[in-house]
């Protein structure tokens, strides 16, 4: 009956720029590749936080490579999202801080943070992994920096640069390199099959997390849990994700299950990821 109460209370999106969370490849070093061509390209420099020119050899390299300055800016800077370094003490919050949290339509189960305009605080919510809106942050700190008021009524920017309230100077903090791989299985994929309490005998599928496969079971027609799919395909789509790579728009990319270690070269460090 709570569904009936909610029926006409629909959370509506507002006129905002599209969701533009930082792409992790924007942190990669410029990579000219092994070939010998001389091609003018652009990359995002995490030290200067700007898009800059470099010479690309014409093959291989990485995703931090763009044909135009505009494309680089669009993919790697936060200007479009009003997430720019604050230069005044009293800065308006970006519009998206006032949006309701939006889990999106996908079926992941990812912890994210949003600014709750009622409580004036950043709070946790579960994000499905695609779409949603811009009031969606990977860390509590990022959410606070962008949407909450600081202790002296000022805000800090999301790159970790804080406005010094004494002399208006910018104090750079350490730059955080985004992690590239995470595992986020929807929690219901880990629950056992639950027939429910009714008397029907419907053919359904559930994800067996022990063997890592979707298996048939008989559903009673009511009750049960969310580990319950009408087709094997739907079950696999929702649950058999293995390692998933965080790349863009707060979204997810499924990666192939390889047994070898995968080596990811990124600015400052090399991250080794062992796939399951």
């Amino acid at each position: 009956d709570s569904e009936e109460d909610e029926e006409h209370t629909i959370i509506t999106d507002t006129e905002l720029p599209p969701l533009k969370l930082m792409h992790s490849f924007c942190a990669f070093k410029a990579d000219d590749g092994p070939c010998k061509a001389i091609m003018k390209r652009f990359f995002f420099n995490i030290f200067t936080r700007q898009c800059e020119e470099f010479i690309y050899g014409g093959c291989e390299g990485n995703q931090n490579r763009f044909e135009s300055l505009e494309e680089c800016k669009k993919m790697c800077t936060r200007d479009n999202a009003n997430r720019i370094i604050k230069t005044t003490l009293q800065q308006e919050k970006p519009d998206f801080c006032f949006l309701e949290e939006d889990p999106g339509i996908c079926r992941g189960y990812i912890t994210r943070y949003f600014y709750n305009n009622q409580t004036k605080q950043c709070e946790r919510f579960k994000y499905g992994g695609c779409l949603g809106n811009m009031n969606n942050f990977e860390t509590l700190e990022e959410c606070k920096n962008i949407c909450e008021d600081g202790p002296n009524g000022f805000q800090v920017d999301n790159y970790g640069t804080q406005l010094n309230a004494v002399n208006n100077s910018l104090t750079p903090q350490s730059t955080k390199v985004p992690s590239l791989f995470e595992f986020h299985g929807p929690s219901w994929c880990l629950t056992p099959a639950d027939r429910g309490l009714c008397r029907a005998n419907e053919n359904r599928f559930y994800y067996n997390s022990v063997i890592g496969k979707c298996r048939p079971f008989k559903y009673s027609g009511c009750g049960g849990n969310e580990n319950n799919f009408t087709s094997k395909q739907e079950c696999l789509r929702a649950c058999k994700k293995g390692f998933i790579q965080r790349i863009s728009k707060g979204g997810l990319i499924k990666t192939k299950r390889k047994r070898k270690k995968q080596r990811v070269k990124i600015a400052y460090e090399e991250i080794f990821v062992k796939n399951m």
Epitope: E234, I253, K254
Partner: antibody, heavy 120, light 107 residues
Amino acid sequence: QVQLQQSGPGLVKPSQTLSLTCAISGDSVSSSSAAWSWIRQSPGRGLEWLGMIYYRSKWYNHYAVSVKSRITINPDTSKNQFSLQLNSVTPEDTAVYYCARGGSGVMDVWGQGTLVTVSS
Amino acid sequence: DIQMTQSPSSLSASVGDRVTITCRASQSITNYLNWYQQKPGKAPKLLIYDVSNLQSGVPSRFSGSGSGTDFTLTISSLQPEDFAVYYCQQYSGYPLTFGQGTKVEIK
């Protein structure tokens, strides 16, 4: 097996409201893993997504900017259906209208389509 | 909006041919891409979701690949029932958008 059955008038006068309904069988409009969309198709525009609703402990919607000021998509949990209302229609809104289910941005089940002609 | 551009807009091929259709997004959509097939007078039918996953019941001669901005639908050996219009669709951002379609005709 999930099925979507569309209903509504095929002829609407300019400036009036286009109203279509999509009845769902084999799934629930308030399923926490589904999203329900309206899409239209016309020779000039191709396939155009108009908007969607979905339930995740409360109802959410998203609309295409091109129709945002004129569109409403509503769920009807008692009848297990959802509806499209498009106000102030013009001949440009003449198209085949489809409802669709999307689990993860993937529109895997579609209604049969309704040709709506806007003409006086 | 994210624009999806398909090429070619139409092609003629014979039964048994290998057919490739490309779809380019105006910005990176990572793997948020689906392919649909539509026959005259019918609703579109989901073929491939998330770039390369075959929808249940779709023949294995259909395959998809790509990432970022460039994607491909391949029909390894064209069958008589494959003559139709094919659409790509992104769900990386609102509004969800489709390509303009590629019509596969009999040569």
